[in-house]
């Protein structure tokens, strides 16, 4: 199996806009499992927002094809879920099927691996990308987006749950990673970080980006997502970096204005559907993909992640919006919801283009230490 | 500019409805705040509303006995104060914060209107 | 909640001092943190917020540092129109709450 070869945004990543920046492809350390990074205070191995916890198999799930839409993984961050930390319960995803609150919470006790063992895997998520290390593989084509327009209605349903704001999807967004590799969107939520700290979830190089946009989808070959949990490409996940730019976006600024009526946790609102992919980058083509896990307990591996190599860019003003307005539990406020990188372990992240060579000046012959194990699927 | 109104002498036990004024911005785009300051004392954190009225908050002093709200399309806040007791006599400010939510910097502040709650 | 304690309560100061006051969080507040002037009979007066942000429209002898628990606000060279009280606001928890206040007095 191929392992997602994760294309780093480079902090100067060109927003969705079209100019695409690579990560910066400096030639760094070996990517290979030092952590190296700086989590925020308490972040150590927390969970991956991914992973949702109670999101995932979460009780709501509904009907096919729509349940996927309900499980929403990626419940994200940073906050700590009610009840007893101490019992690792194994639902410490969420409690109860609307209730996005699990035992864990991001920096602090208890440590994930209690609240679900495979939160100490070896295959974790999220990883620092280092472009000059990623396998060049010409056969990661571009990303196949199908249905992802949507209509204003019916509208969607845009929750707080005290971890992440997490936007589920409606049946029907099918996604392809390439041929027989096909995926349905269930959810998508946001990581971000606080006043002058950024929150990206991934890093390009050790350099976290303000925030990070998740779409975390169920591969066709299964129903339901507790099927996929931990299963080779069972699920995949959609990353992409935010950056500050010039303008206001447009089309997170559809989800960014509706923040403050779901400033509490746990609160929820209804929003017309919009353009899914018009909050994600431009180009399909130019990615880093591997293998890892959900980012939150339960932190289910065989995840594919597919970071995408140009960013998105948002104004300042929205992405102070994003870190300032939402609460979590005990009116702490919700911000620094991201997992410490983790080791990669021996796993090499794939890039769909030739990260590798750096056009900077600093490196004077292009270094491509590892080479693309999966051609196909 | 923020103008309040409404103050005056109450008896313990009354109620008061403050209202305070917004013009010269975009009201509905800016959480809204009390703010009261007791006669020689500090600044005290009453209550906050956001943008779209969606969210409303209160200090512990007061819950259950005073209630927000604003009309967005007359651009002004108030705060119905039930239950009044001595320990509310203060200047009562209004304060529009930095942004849509309700916790944040207060950047403009009204001239504050005087509450007395006494026998 | 979050204490914010201020200190001095008050000082003594002349015309053309460098005044420095403090504000001390019980707890980490990153840098949201905001300083206030108030002079007798009117409204408190947003100088910083951001810990470190001058608002629009405030003389640039104002200026605040610091980040996590402590924050200061300096005035480089105190102008006769400064005396007055001054109070930091955090505003990172729920509530929102403010230091005890700091006078500056003539000298």
């Known amino acids: 199996q191929r392992l997602p070869r994760m294309q780093e945004d480079s902090p100067l990543g060109g927003g969705s806009s079209g100019e695409d920046d690579p990560l910066g492809e400096e030639d760094l350390p070996s990517e290979e499992d030092s952590p190296r990074e700086e989590d925020p205070p308490g972040e150590e191995d927390l969970p991956g927002e991914e992973d949702l916890p109670g999101e995932e198999d979460l009780p709501e799930v509904k009907p096919k094809s729509e349940e996927e839409g309900s499980l929403k993984l990626e419940d994200l961050p940073t906050v700590e879920a009610p009840g007893d930390p101490q019992e690792p319960q194994n639902n410490a995803h969420r409690d109860k099927e609307g209730d996005d609150q699990s035992h864990w919470r991001y920096g602090g006790d208890p440590p994930w691996p209690r609240v679900s063992p495979a939160c100490a895997g070896r295959f974790q998520s999220p990883v620092d990308i280092r472009p000059q290390l990623a396998a060049f593989c010409p056969a990661l084509r571009p990303l196949e987006l199908l249905g992802f327009q949507l209509p204003p209605l019916p509208e969607l349903r845009l929750r707080n749950n005290g971890h992440s704001v997490q936007l589920t999807l409606p049946p029907g967004l099918e996604m392809a990673l390439g041929p027989g590799r096909e995926y349905r969107a269930l959810q998508l939520h946001l990581h971000w970080g606080a006043a002058g700290r950024p929150g990206s979830e991934h890093t390009v190089e050790g350099h976290r980006f303000p925030a990070e946009i998740h779409v975390v989808h169920l591969s066709t070959a299964f129903a339901r997502v507790d099927e996929a949990l931990g299963r080779p490409g069972g699920l995949a996940v959609l990353a992409a970096f935010l950056e500050e730019g010039p303008e206001e976006n447009s089309a997170y600024e559809q989800l960014l204005s509706r923040l403050e009526e779901i400033a509490e946790e746990g609160s929820e609102t209804q929003v017309p559907g919009l353009d899914i992919s018009a909050l994600l980058p431009s180009d399909f083509s130019r990615y880093f993909q591997y293998e890892g896990s959900l980012t939150t307990p339960p932190c289910a591996q065989g995840v594919i992640w597919t970071v995408f190599n140009q960013t998105v860019m948002l104004s300042a003003k929205q992405l102070h919006t994003l870190s300032d307005t939402l609460w979590g539990p005990g009116d702490s406020r919700l911000q620094l919801n991201f997992r410490a990188t983790q080791p990669l372990n021996g796993r090499v992240i794939e890039a769909s283009f030739p990260a590798g060579v750096d056009s900077s000046p600093r490196a004077a012959e292009p270094v491509q230490l590892n080479s693309c194990l999966a051609a196909g699927d | 500019e923020l103008v309040e109104s409404g103050g005056g002498l109450v008896q313990p036990g009354g109620s008061l409805r403050l209202s305070c004024a917004a013009s010269g911005f975009t009201f509905s785009s800016y959480g809204m705040s009390w703010v009261r300051q007791a006669p020689g004392k500090g600044l005290e954190w009453v209550s906050g509303?956001?943008?779209?009225?969606?969210?409303?908050y209160y200090a512990d002093s007061v819950k259950g006995r005073f209630t927000i709200s604003r009309d967005n399309s007359k651009n002004t806040l108030y705060l119905q104060m039930n239950s009044l007791r001595a320990e509310d006599t203060a200047v009562y400010y209004c304060a529009r914060t930095g942004s849509p939510g309700t916790f944040m910097h207060g950047d403009h502040w009204g001239q504050g209107t005087l509450v007395t709650v006494s026998s | 909640d979050i204490q914010m304690t201020q200190s001095p309560s008050s000082l003594s100061a002349s015309v053309g001092d460098r005044v420095t006051i403090t504000c001390r969080a019980s707890q980490d507040i990153n840098n949201y943190l905001s300083w206030y002037q108030q002079k007798p009979g009117k409204a408190p007066k947003l100088l910083i917020y951001g810990a470190s942000n001058l608002q629009s429209g405030v003389p640039s002898r104002f200026s605040g540092s610091g980040s996590g628990t402590d924050f200061t606000l300096t005035i480089s060279s105190l102008q006769p129109e400064d005396f007055a009280v001054y109070y930091c606001q955090q505003y990172y928890g729920r509530p929102t709450t403010f230091g005890q206040g700091t006078k500056v007095e003539i000298k």
């Open positions: 509303i956001s943008s779209l009225g969606s969210t409303t």
